[in-house]
């Protein structure tokens, strides 16, 4: 039967190190990786294996690795965010946007920057609702419909149908009837769209229309990605 090699060991030509091992280019040996929540305190040599140590507070490693230092957890979630995953030795903190906000600048996991969902002003209704990663799209109310609210969820509603019209409706106001029994083509009352649903898909940010409430542009410098923790092999 084949001998089981204990780390560190010299790999055979054309072979790779085993699962949870890496090839140390200095030692020229296959050596043990450190488990999630740990990092390499000392790299292996020809005669001694990798020495692993636990990540310090506010740092983590998520994968089997041989990084000399654990990665720093992201900064605390801002007031427009909620912490959906806490920082532990094995995982980074994940911040997501609170209800009524969407992610304007995402990162590998969670959101870097949240922005408030656009509110459609009177005369405009929601054409496409906001999601976790895309803003609301507004559209002008078509003839026969109106919206008299500033809202990120209200769509254009049909005017009530009057026997006798006192004041005709327009895009931002319902018709006013003189008769006592107006009818509608839809059930009365405001129609609300559901709050943003959870989605991982990325949507193209629509260009703000002159008809919408003012929206702030957000810009942040993009820092370098954290070092890869995966091993490579033949």
């Amino acid at each position: 039967p084949a001998q089981v090699a204990f780390t560190p060991y010299a790999p055979e030509p054309g072979s790779t190190c085993r699962l949870r091992e890496y090839y140390d280019q200095t030692a020229q040996m296959c050596c043990s990786k450190c488990s999630p929540g740990q990092h390499a305190k000392a790299f292996c040599t020809k005669t001694s294996d990798t020495v692993c140590d636990s990540c310090e507070d506010s740092t983590y490693t998520q994968l089997w690795n041989w990084v000399p230092e654990c990665l720093s957890c992201g900064s605390r979630c801002s007031s427009d965010q909620v912490e959906t995953q806490a920082c532990t030795r094995e995982q980074n903190r994940i911040c997501t946007c609170r209800p009524g906000w969407y992610c304007a600048l995402s990162k590998q996991e969670g959101c870097r920057l949240c922005a408030p969902l656009r509110k459609c002003r009177p005369g405009f209704g929601v054409a496409r609702p906001g999601t976790e990663t895309s803003d609301v799209v507004c559209k002008p109310c078509a003839p026969g419909t109106f919206s008299n609210t500033t809202s990120s969820t209200d769509i254009c509603r049909p005017h009530q149908i009057c026997n006798v019209v006192a004041i005709p409706g327009n895009a931002s106001m319902d018709a006013v009837c003189t008769s006592t029994s107006p009818t509608r083509s839809m059930a009365p009352g405001a129609v609300h769209l559901p709050q943003p649903v959870s989605t991982r898909s990325q949507h193209t940010q629509p260009t703000p229309e002159p008809s919408t409430a003012p929206s702030t542009s957000f810009l942040l410098p993009m820092g370098p990605s954290p070092p890869a923790e995966g091993s490579t092999g033949d």
């Epitope: 560190p8 060991y9 010299a10 790999p11 030509p13 790779t16 090839y23 280019q25 200095t26 020229q28 040996m29 020809k46 005669t47 490579t232 092999g233 033949d234």
Partner: antibody
Framework: QIQLVQSGPELKKPGETVKISCKAS????????MSWVKQAPGKGLKWMGW????????TYADDFKGRFAFSLETSASTAYLQINNLKNEDTATYFC????????WGQGTLVTVSA | DIVLTQSPASLAVSLGQRATISCRAS??????????MHWYQQKAGQSFKLLIY???NLESGIPARFSGSGSRTDFTLTINPVEADDVATYYC?????????FGGGTKLEIK
Amino acid sequence: QIQLVQSGPELKKPGETVKISCKASGYTFTTFGMSWVKQAPGKGLKWMGWINTYSGVPTYADDFKGRFAFSLETSASTAYLQINNLKNEDTATYFCARRSNFAYWGQGTLVTVSA
Amino acid sequence: DIVLTQSPASLAVSLGQRATISCRASESVDSSGNSFMHWYQQKAGQSFKLLIYRASNLESGIPARFSGSGSRTDFTLTINPVEADDVATYYCQQSNEDPWTFGGGTKLEIK
């Protein structure tokens, strides 16, 4: 199979610079370091040092500190040796060799330095 | 640095006979149960071919006429029987510690 293909011969004047390439194939380039070895006419083999292909950090043997530089183009699986301010004694064949305790070698690049 | 002394510098052997090349290290090249000594063949105007790695392991595709032995400081490359195609210079190399060092080479000729 594992192959290291080096650039062609170079004829240079003293004081000039030469850059030799070594393109690797048949394995994951960033797994194994790349060493450089000098073979001067009528002389023995001298290990010049190596470059870590994962981190990009070079290590130079004592006799090759200063005018010599190792570099990488990882996306092209290629290692480079640059020699600045060439001298007559740099005339030699230079080999790249995969650093996996034993070595797989390139075919060599002859550099001739002559006025 | 580990100094490798190779002997003889040249060797003339009849076809079908045994050729033995020695390599002595100034200090042990053993670590973790391995001897980090390797043997290469260089034919005239060509590059190096790995024959034996870690003292006694035959590289894939190399004929079994080539064998290696030894540990710590004393190593031997044996070619038996020698063929005409074996005319070349043979080098030992250690990789137990940096800098890698090489023997001075042994030139094998046919008698």
